[in-house]
């Protein structure tokens, strides 16, 4: 059937709750395709009704919740103009119980998140929330050990933790609590960080690798909105900062007034061995003098660019 | 630095069996997928097999399907080839390779081979 | 399968010259083609992967262009250490993996 097959290296666990996963795989997804999820190798499509339980939504596979039996191989088969590419996800649903005295304790956490925060440093846990646009999101609440965080060392901050001079007692099994809302329906997502103290700071040693942008030239037609991804693989203990920077300087800071061009909230994925850093750049509207400027995505050590350049003329329309 | 050598290989009769190996050093052996390819005497290129970073599948191509198995013992960072029922046309030099590391933290069913190793030669031979 | 068909054969060239060996896939494989060299008694060696992504450590003098059923390796002018048997391989529809016949580069 003509398909590059793709498959992830690990399994995704994940409890009896809310749970979505994009089908992206860059750069493939960064033109005009089709995305299309199914499960265990059926002919038939997930529905895409949003009232089903487990439905598409746009590139996204959504449950609603997660159930037992939802478990399995599923495969979304991403179609451009001259290329098919089918990723195959293996999804495993295990019950968690969080703070349930019975079972007492917290439970296995061979699906958590682990997070990394310095001695003596301002440093901050993030809660990793992944939903399409259609899930409204909720403040969202920090626990450890079970017990809900406060004291005037911790600030919450959108989807992260601030922890102001980290200590070694700062260590431990935390929690991140969202309400999700969908259709007018309401569910909880609970995601557990196991966390560990390092005293280690700065660059970690670790060479992170831009997996894209490759150091090469987009066209793109003047004033149109452009978003372009850096997508880096890094070590999990990484200490690297990742950011978009122009003539040296962050976007966020070069584009200060005006804000045209803006820098997108990092995101990860959580892999066997590293993990997958996306940090996008948002051009509201391309303008003259961003043509020809390297825009780099810096990661740690490493530097990659893209240069905006006008399509060339289509002379078939004169 | 990243090194793979192959071994194992010499004269044998036709209907006989070979186990070849490759012993892989300064990379993570585990992380990746690993091919053979062979060339015969004057002749092109031709996979032969590929072993996932885990040895979770292998796949082959026709020529050699239900002869040669490949395997890998990730402990000891060696690939292996047990050749079975070796014929005339399986004379050839024998290459292991690394497959591509195309998609960090996806594998597919090979992309390329970006490291090889210097070839162990087979030949059956009445 | 997927067919590999490369041309010429054999091409003959001198040192300083711009040389084209192109591949032809059977159906559509993307962008998902590589190119090797290959020298007498030695391995292969990785060129150019998806196309035209230049390998750690190969000269730039290499590069590779196209998409779907059209490819081409380009040197831009030849060297002495150049002179080789190179490859293409797509890796779109695996298994198998298939490799082009072969291009044999000789001194003019």
């Known amino acids: 059937d003509g398909c590059k097959d793709i498959f992830m290296k690990n399994e995704i666990l994940s409890a009896s709750q809310p749970f979505a996963f994009n089908c992206t795989f860059p750069p493939i997804t960064s033109g005009e395709v089709s995305v299309t999820w199914y499960k265990n190798s059926s002919k038939i499509p997930v529905s895409k009704i949003i009232q089903s339980r487990i439905h598409q939504d746009e590139t996204w596979i959504l449950f609603l919740p997660m159930e037992w039996g939802d478990s399995g191989v599923y495969q979304c088969v991403i179609k451009g103009r001259d290329s098919c590419h089918r990723i195959h996800v293996n999804l495993t649903v295990f019950e968690k119980h969080w703070c349930d005295t019975s079972i007492g304790g917290l439970p296995n956490l061979s699906d958590e998140y682990k997070q990394i925060l310095h001695l003596g440093k301002d440093d901050s846990l993030t809660c990793h929330l992944h939903f399409p646009k259609s899930c409204v999101l909720g403040p969202i609440k920090w626990y450890k050990d079970c017990n809900e965080i406060k004291g005037e060392r911790f600030t919450v901050l959108e989807t992260r933790l601030l922890v102001s001079n980290v200590s070694a007692e700062d260590r431990g099994n935390y929690a991140c609590q969202a309400i999700l809302t969908h259709s007018g329906k309401q569910y909880e997502v609970l995601n557990g960080i196991t966390v560990s103290i390092t005293e280690r700071a700065g660059y970690g040693g670790s060479v992170p690798k831009i997996i894209y942008p490759k150091n090469h030239s987009i066209e793109v037609q003047l004033g149109t909105t452009l978003i372009v991804d850096c997508n880096v693989t890094d070590t999990k203990d990484n200490t690297n900062l990742r950011c978009w920077r122009v003539n040296n300087t962050l976007v966020d800071d070069y584009y200060d007034e005006s804000k045209r061009i803006r820098e997108g909230v990092e995101t990860h994925v959580s892999f066997r061995e590293h993990n997958l850093y996306t940090v996008n750049i948002t051009f509201l509207e391309v303008k003259m003098e961003d043509y020809g400027l390297p825009f780099m995505c810096h990661a740690g050590v490493s530097t990659a660019y893209i240069i905006l350049q006008l399509p060339a003329p289509d002379f078939r329309a004169y | 630095q990243v090194q793979l050598v192959e071994s194992g290989g010499g004269v044998v009769q036709p209907g006989k069996s070979l186990r070849l190996s490759c012993a892989a050093s300064?990379?993570?052996?585990?992380?990746?997928?690993i091919h053979w390819v062979r060339q015969a005497p004057g002749k092109g290129l031709e996979w032969v097999a590929i072993i996932l970073y885990d040895g979770s599948n292998q796949h082959y191509a026709d020529s050699v399907k239900g002869r040669f198995t490949i395997s890998r013992d990730n402990s000891k960072n060696t690939l292996y080839l047990q050749m079975n029922n070796l014929r005339a046309e399986d004379t050839a030099v024998y290459y292991c390779?690394?497959?591509?590391?195309?998609?960090?933290?996806?594998?597919?069913?090979?992309?390329?081979?970006?490291?090889w190793g210097q070839g162990t030669t087979v030949t059956v031979s009445s | 399968d997927i067919q590999m068909t490369q041309s010429p054969s054999s091409l003959s060239a001198s040192v300083g010259d711009r040389v084209t060996i192109t591949c032809r896939a059977s159906?559509?494989?993307?962008?998902?083609l590589n190119w090797y060299q290959q020298k007498p008694g030695k391995a292969p060696k990785l060129l150019i992967y998806a196309a035209s992504s230049l390998q750690s450590g190969v000269p730039s003098r290499f590069s590779g262009s196209g998409s779907g059923t059209d490819f081409t390796l380009t040197i831009s002018s030849l060297q002495p250490e150049d002179f080789a048997t190179y490859y293409c391989?797509?890796?779109?529809?695996?298994?198998?993996?298939?490799f082009g016949q072969g291009t044999r580069l000789e001194i003019k």
């Open positions: 390779a690394r497959d591509l590391d195309l998609w960090s933290g996806y594998y597919t069913n090979g992309d390329g081979m970006d490291v």
């Open positions: 159906q559509s494989i993307s962008s998902y």
């Open positions: 391989q797509q890796s779109y529809s695996t298994p198998p993996i298939t």
């Open positions: 300064g990379f993570t052996f585990s992380n990746y997928g």
